[in-house]
């Protein structure tokens, strides 16, 4: 009997109630491999989730997050609120990055500006809350009297769209 079930392809299940006949998965369920005794219930993308890929008889639905949120975890198991660039999400909501740190995305944490001297370089462009520094040549490469750091470009909304 087991051999009969192994013949059931993806999108079907081996129906014990019908003498091991391969029956199609019912609506809103799927089987992604052959030889299944049951079909799995399709994931539903509700609330802060939106459907990225509809469920089919052979594959589960895939979810994304609605605007203003981003995915976390395997297969977008959670949605986390976006912040603005120059901020990070804390338990009390979005907070500005502290001086000396930046976040150039709508998600993630504020990170320390790169330490250019670690690589023997100088600071070419100063960091901001939204941008890391840009490192430049080593101080020895700079001509005498030249300023090692230039001010950041005027603040603007770079329109980051991280995943």
């Amino acid at each position: 009997l087991q051999d009969l079930c192994s013949n059931c392809p993806a999108g079907t299940f081996c129906d014990n109630n019908r003498s091991q006949i391969c029956s199609p998965c019912p609506p809103n369920s799927f089987s992604s491999a052959g030889g299944q005794r049951t079909c799995d219930i399709c994931r539903q993308c509700k609330g802060v989730f939106k459907t990225r890929k509809e469920c089919s008889s052979t594959s589960n639905a895939e979810c994304d997050c609605i605007s203003g949120y981003h995915c976390l975890g395997a297969e977008c198991s959670m949605c986390e609120q976006d912040c603005k660039q120059g901020q990070e999400l804390t338990k009390k909501g979005c907070k500005d990055c502290c001086f000396g740190t930046f976040n150039d995305q709508k998600r993630g944490i504020c990170r320390p500006w790169t330490n250019c001297s670690l690589d023997g370089k100088s600071v070419l462009v100063n960091g901001t809350k939204e941008r890391d520094v840009v490192c430049g040549p080593s101080p020895a490469d700079l001509s005498p009297g030249a300023s090692s750091a230039t001010p950041p470009a005027p603040a603007r909304e770079p329109g980051h769209s991280p995943q």
């Epitope: 790169t114 670690l118 470009a153 603007r156 769209s161 991280p162």
Partner: antibody, heavy 119, light 107 residues
Amino acid sequence: QVQLVQSGAEVKKPGASVKVSCKASGYTFTSYWINWVKQAPGQGLEWIGNIYPSDSYTNYNQKFKDKATITADKSTSTAYMELSSLRSEDTAVYYCTRDYGSAYSYSLWGQGTTVTVSS
Amino acid sequence: DIQMTQSPSSLSASVGDRVTITCRPSQDISNYLNWYQQKPDKTVKLLIYYTSRLRSGVPSRFSGSGSGTDFTFTISSLQPEDIATYFCQQGDTLPYTFGQGTKLEIK
């Protein structure tokens, strides 16, 4: 000396997976982003994603989100990129790169790893 | 995604010629524009970063200029060892994107 050394060429069948490695040496691995870049035969360069080895924070190009998984092992100063469900269009040279003091440009490139997908 | 329109896609020039390549992003990227050289053996090297900053050790015949949505890469006097494909890349906005490349040949 400062360098990135990638694993050797791979030939895989459609549907298989491949894991490419990128070993860093000569600098503090945890202080710089590692990026992965794809170059299909006769084509330009495409940014796949990057990782900050210090905390394994990753960014992905949406186009490669379901294809590539980027990881890093601090103990061996090695970054990895796994490509799943391989298809013929995944045939390419894959480069790992290190940023130039901030994530916005890539000063150091690996020699490239050729991945060929063929039945 | 920001599209990077690079032109020309290929060009042939003589040793000593001045060569110019342009790169036009589909939106303002401030000065976050870099230029790379890929030699025929597929090795890749950063030449210019942040629009106009010459990487240490790169010959001064290479230069870059521009801002916003219009950038130029120039080789002031072409040398035989400059045979390569050149790419621009924006580092302003994720996902970072490259131009399609300019293949440079010697006449």
